[in-house]
């Protein structure tokens, strides 16, 4: 058993049929010695008396808010949560496996630049009685500070019969140099509590590996005289690291109709303009990627050909 | 501790081309190592990230773009003194700081060159003959060093009398290649910045 936060404790249980469970001793936080009784949750049934209460925690029915009272007055609370371990593996029931970039990916993180700011998100089908707490650091043995905000519900989607909820959190490394060469990864730890179930999820990454620039901005078309070719120009996204001559991007320019199966024109360039062939009912799209370290491409920025 | 904005004339920066070749060569070599050593811990997640130049050179700090010198977090540098001549310095107005930056890059290359050559000598003794260093990568390191053209004491190639542990050597190769790729990215960014200045 360990303390998650003040008056909240996590009991780690091997989860299998007829498991013996864990013996837990609760102590009432009071100077009083006599006349103390214990109850669980909203029940008025007295579970025991005395300053300590010993319980055998085997299942979710044994978890919950234990309260010690004296003469009708509440003295203190202890909330017990369960963390299940099945076949030596901690349960991952609360969050959905996003399977990208690999299986057992519960947390996904992205950074728009090298400033040390990043966003992580996760998915769940659970809609109520759900809380998340996020901690992060650079390295684990001698951790350096990363400050994370509160996790918030950022999107709701309908997937078949199910509703899916996306939560996200923003974090900022306390003292980040955009030009630094990372040798210790960022560690992100998410504590998830659903009713009386506790789970924790972790992700470890270098900022350089989770870079995904914003799409290029200010796309403009200039038809070339006596030609079917069009000069398309754009600018670096505002959120990208500066100076741009140091943090350079490379671009992919594509002309395509509405369907992905349609024919297309495609060209790659390090410049902020390119010449392509425009077709009726097609769109010109441009996306960006770090020129020197190939992490993710940005989303497309698009303008219609006409 | 920073690069001035008005340095070489545009297009007069001969090291840019070499630094692009360097990044390409080390990336190819790393990809080859990952594929060939698929049953060894050779991915970014699996290896320890070591920097053989740590406390010996200060490339990131010495080559910091002027715009980043206002960032307190970028200025915790170790001072290192270097020789200040070199053919990539395309203008007489080149500042001492730029010379410091380029000589720091030169020292990095020299250290990695020695490590890679020593390692290749060991890998050539491996009866499995599983992996060797790409001669192209070693040649590209050499070309960039020549373009930088700093006078510097030659570092003797480390020789070892004991039997090499080939497993450890291959793990170390992965560690070195990952670190060298990150440094090659920095070098490419620096050269691009100087070329644009």
């Amino acid at each position: 058993i360990w303390e998650l936060k003040k008056d909240v404790y996590v009991v780690e249980l091997d989860w299998y049929p007829d498991a013996p469970g864990e013996m837990v001793v609760l102590t009432c936080d009071t100077p009083e010695e006599d006349g103390i009784t214990w109850t669980l949750d909203q029940s008025s049934e007295v579970l025991g008396s005395g300053k300590t209460l010993t319980i055998q925690v085997k299942e979710f029915g044994d978890a919950g808010q234990y309260t010690c009272h004296k003469g009708g007055e509440v003295l203190s609370h202890s909330l017990l949560l369960l963390h299940k371990k099945e076949d030596g593996i901690w349960s991952t029931d609360i969050l959905k496996d996003q399977k990208e970039p690999k299986n057992k990916t519960f947390l996904r993180c992205e950074a728009k630049n090298y400033s040390g700011r990043f966003t992580c998100w996760w998915l769940t089908t659970i809609s109520t009685d759900l809380t998340f707490s996020v901690k992060s650091s650079r390295g684990s043995s001698d951790p350096q500070g990363v400050t994370c905000g509160a996790a918030t519900l950022s999107a709701e989607r309908v997937r078949g019969d199910n509703k899916e909820y996306e939560y996200s959190v923003e974090c900022q490394e306390d003292s980040a140099c955009p030009a630094a060469e990372e040798s210790l990864p960022i560690e992100v730890m998410v504590d998830a509590v659903h009713k009386l179930k506790y789970e924790n999820y972790t992700s470890s990454f270098f900022i350089r590996d989770i870079i995904k620039p914003d799409p290029p901005k200010n796309l403009q078309l200039k038809p070339l005289k006596n030609s079917r070719q069009v000069e398309v120009s754009w600018e670096y996204p505002d959120t990208w690291s500066t100076p741009h001559s140091y943090f350079s991007l490379t671009f992919c320019v594509q002309v395509q109709g509405k369907s992905k199966r349609e024919k297309k024109d495609r060209v790659f360039t390090d410049k902020t303009s390119a010449t392509v062939i425009c077709r009726k009912n097609a769109s010109i799209s441009v996306r960006a990627q770090d020129r020197y370290y190939s992490s993710s491409w940005s989303e497309w920025a698009s303008v219609p050909c006409s | 501790r920073n690069l001035p904005v008005a340095t070489p004339d545009p297009g007069m920066f001969p090291c840019l081309h070499h630094s692009q070749n360097l990044l390409r060569a080390v990336s190819n070599m790393l990809q080859k190592a990952r594929q060939t050593l698929e049953f060894y811990p050779c991915t970014s997640e699996e290896i320890d990230h070591e920097d053989i130049t740590k406390d010996k050179t200060s490339t990131v700090e010495a080559c910091l773009p002027l715009e980043l010198t206002k960032n307190e977090s970028c200025l915790n540098s170790r001072e290192t003194s270097f020789i200040t001549n070199g053919s990539c310095l395309a203008s007489r107005k080149t500042s001492f700081m730029m010379a410091l930056c380029l000589s720091s890059i030169y020292e990095d290359l020299k250290m990695y060159q020695v490590e890679f050559k020593t390692m290749n000598a060991k890998l050539l003794m491996d009866p499995k003959r599983q992996i060797f260093l790409d001669q192209n990568m070693l040649a590209v390191i050499d070309e960039l060093m020549q373009a930088l053209n700093f006078n510097s004491e030659t570092v003797p190639q480390k020789s070892s009398l004991e039997e090499p542990d080939f497993y450890k050597t291959k793990i170390k190769l992965c560690i070195l290649l990952h670190a060298f790729r990150i440094r090659a990215v920095t070098i490419d960014r620096v050269m691009s910045y100087l070329n644009a200045s």
């Epitope: 079917r228 070719q229 490379t250 199966r261 349609e262 024919k263 297309k264 024109d265 495609r266 060209v267 790659f268 360039t269 390090d270 010449t275 062939i277 077709r279 009726k280 | -």
Partner: antibody, heavy 118, light 107 residues
Framework: QVQLVQSGAEVKKPGASVKVSCKAS????????LHWVRQAPGQGLEWMGW????????EYAPKFQGRVTMTTDTSTSTAYMELRSLRSDDTAVYYC???????????WGQGTMVTVSS | EIVMTQSPATLSVSPGERATLSCRAS??????LHWYQQKPGQAPRLLIY???QSISGIPARFSGSGSGTEFTLTISSLQSEDFAVYYC?????????FGGGTKVEIK
């Protein structure tokens, strides 16, 4: 699968014209760009131009501008390349090729040998 | 127009050995570079597109790399069916242009 079948070999006199055909099967002609590339005996490859069968748009290499015409007949799924004012150095194998991407060549025809000789 | 230069013109390699073919562009073309294989009496066949993207059905021993002005096609272990002429082609701008080719022959 996508296939391109070209017309047979031709022998032409200098100053004459030649029209090579390229019949597409296994796909709808308008779904792909169509290029023509030639190869003189023992020489390398030379791009001549492309046509978008969907709208008839064309782009020719400057070297062939004014001397070449590329057309398509969607009803028969056939593309044509006509080269006029033939010279002896136009002796080559002429290939048609198709791709959903405009700038490289995925599916090639078997080639048509055109000999220009007096 | 962009001039593509391939080297060497002829490469003599023993079966099982590694072959490295080079292609250089007269100006920077990013990764707009494609590789083809041509055997005598046959039409060319696309091997690699956009410098390093492999084509399904093409053996994994063929790989491409490079960007800017310098590109490489590597055949990791030459098989008898790989002896042919290899062409690079740029698609950075029109007119599309090919290199002069590299003939890979048996040593």
């Amino acid at each position: 699968q996508v296939q391109l079948v070209q017309s047979g070999a031709e022998v032409k006199k200098p100053g004459a014209s030649v029209k090579v055909s390229c019949k597409a099967s296994g796909y709808t002609l308008t779904d792909y760009y169509l290029h023509w590339v030639r190869q003189a005996p023992g020489q390398g490859l030379e791009w001549m131009g492309w046509i978008d069968p969907e709208n008839g748009d064309t782009e020719y290499a400057p070297k062939f501008q004014g001397r070449v015409t590329m057309t398509t007949d969607t009803s028969t799924s056939t593309a044509y390349m006509e080269l006029r004012s033939l010279r002896s150095d136009d002796t080559a194998v002429y290939y048609c090729n198709a791709n959903k991407e405009l700038r490289y060549f995925d599916v090639w025809g078997q080639g048509t040998m055109v000999t220009v000789s007096s | 127009e962009i001039v593509m230069t391939q080297s060497p013109a002829t490469l003599s390699v023993s079966p099982g050995e590694r072959a490295t073919l080079s292609c250089r562009a007269s100006q920077s073309i990013s990764i707009n570079l494609h590789w083809y294989q041509q055997k005598p009496g046959q039409a060319p066949r696309l091997l690699i597109y956009f410098a390093r993207q492999s084509i399904s059905g093409i053996p994994a021993r063929f790989s491409g790399s490079g960007s800017g002005t310098e590109f490489t096609l590597t055949i990791s272990s030459l098989q008898s069916e790989d002896f042919a002429v290899y062409y690079c082609q740029q698609s950075n701008s029109f007119p599309l242009t090919f290199g002069g080719g590299t003939k890979v022959e048996i040593k």
